[in-house]
């Protein structure tokens, strides 16, 4: 392991479409692959009238946008589908929306998924 880097070996897995896809709805997904590539966790979700609906969670491929992010945070302003990625085992268990705004002070909106 490289000093100061969180290696991702497993992520929380979730699939909202699990019945149709014939997968587990939730679980732990091992992240493996090329030794020279970094691995990350991700989460995607929607905000339907203030209610959080998780779409997918799992392992994400080597992505510089995820490097050294210990927390899973979406920074885009009001996307239709929220996305975040992070490094570290199960770092996608919790995710949050923290939009980067130009003028106003950003406010954190942490999201803790409720168990199904």
């Amino acid at each position: 392991a490289i000093l100061g880097r969180s290696e991702t070996q497993e992520c929380l897995f979730f699939n909202a479409n699990w019945e149709k896809d014939r997968t587990n709805q939730t679980g732990v997904e091992p992240c493996y692959g090329d030794k020279d590539k970094r691995r990350h966790c991700f989460a995607t979700w929607k905000n339907i009238s203030g209610s959080i609906e998780i779409v997918k969670q799992g392992c994400w491929l080597d992505d510089i946008n995820c490097y050294d992010r210990t927390d899973c945070v979406e920074k885009k302003d009001s996307p239709e589908v929220y996305f975040c990625c992070c490094e570290g085992n199960m770092c996608n268990e919790k995710f949050s929306y923290f939009p980067e705004m130009e003028v106003t002070q950003p406010t954190s909106n942490p999201v803790t998924p409720k168990p199904p």
């Epitope: 997968t23 692959g33 491929l61």
Partner: antibody
Framework: EVQLLESGGGLVQPGGSLRLSCAAS????????MSWVRQAPGKGLEWVSS????????YYADSVKGRFTISRDNSKNTLYLQMNSLRAEDTAVYYC?????????????WGQGTLVTVSS | DIQMTQSPSSLSASVGDRVTITCRAS??????LNWYQQKPGKAPKLLIY???ILQGGVPSRFSGSGSGTDFTLTISSLQPEDFATYYC?????????FGGGTKVEIK
């Protein structure tokens, strides 16, 4: 070196059947989801079907659902596509492709393809 | 199914030109967008995944951007070997779909 080699293509009459095979080497086959993608002559790419590494989860395009069956034999490192009730519009080059481990699941290695012609 | 619309369907350009290809999804697909290059008679080759991440071994003149519904593939300085057809693909939905392709031809 990752290699994917398709076989089994050929000329078949409408309503007929064909089974395509894809022999994989150079990687741990069971770790990877595999897919079939086709390309009709002079047309674009069309995803056909995918199967998880264990073979337990399968996915199909609506255009082939109920007619095509994807499967794999992990002991032989081989992917299959059983095609039944073939139609003229199924005429295409069929590519076997390996899916990356982890989202967004790009197809990182492709075979050279096998041509399926459905004609009377 | 999610529809992927590429534009233009074809373009003519010269070596050294900056080329931009766009791909639009019929609904938000976050960053679940991949780009492929295909040369005549050959299998497609992965260029970019996750909307912006360059696949290993792909020259840095290729870049991708976008999220949600609008995506762009840019070739900063077109080389002779870049004349090919380019396809976007969404993997957000289990029913994967490709764009119709953009053929990049020599002017």
């Amino acid at each position: 070196e990752v290699q994917l080699l398709e076989s089994g293509g050929g000329l078949v009459q409408p309503g007929g059947s064909l089974r395509l095979s894809c022999a994989a080497s150079g990687f741990t086959f069971t770790d990877y989801a595999m897919s079939w993608v086709r390309q009709a002559p002079g047309k674009g790419l069309e995803w056909v079907s995918s199967v998880s590494g264990s073979g337990s989860s399968t996915y199909y395009a609506d255009s082939v659902k109920g007619r095509f069956t994807i499967s794999r034999d992990n002991s032989k490192n081989t992917l299959y596509l059983q095609m039944n009730s073939l139609r003229a519009e199924d005429t295409a080059v069929y590519y076997c492709a390996r899916g990356s481990i982890g989202a967004p699941w790009p197809l990182d290695y492709w075979g050279q393809g096998t041509l399926v012609t459905v004609s009377s | 199914d999610i529809q992927m619309t590429q534009s233009p369907s074809s373009l003519s350009a010269s070596v050294g030109d900056r080329v931009t290809i766009t791909c639009r999804a019929s609904q938000s697909i976050s960053r679940f967008l991949n780009w492929y290059q295909q040369k005549p008679g050959k299998a497609p080759k992965l260029l970019i995944y996750g909307a912006s991440i360059l696949q290993g071994g792909v020259p840095s003149r290729f870049s991708g951007s976008g999220s949600g519904t609008d995506f762009t593939l840019t070739i900063s300085s077109l080389q002779p070997e870049d004349f090919a057809t380019y396809y976007c693909q969404q993997t957000y939905s289990t029913q994967w779909t490709f764009g119709g392709g953009t053929k990049v031809e020599i002017k």
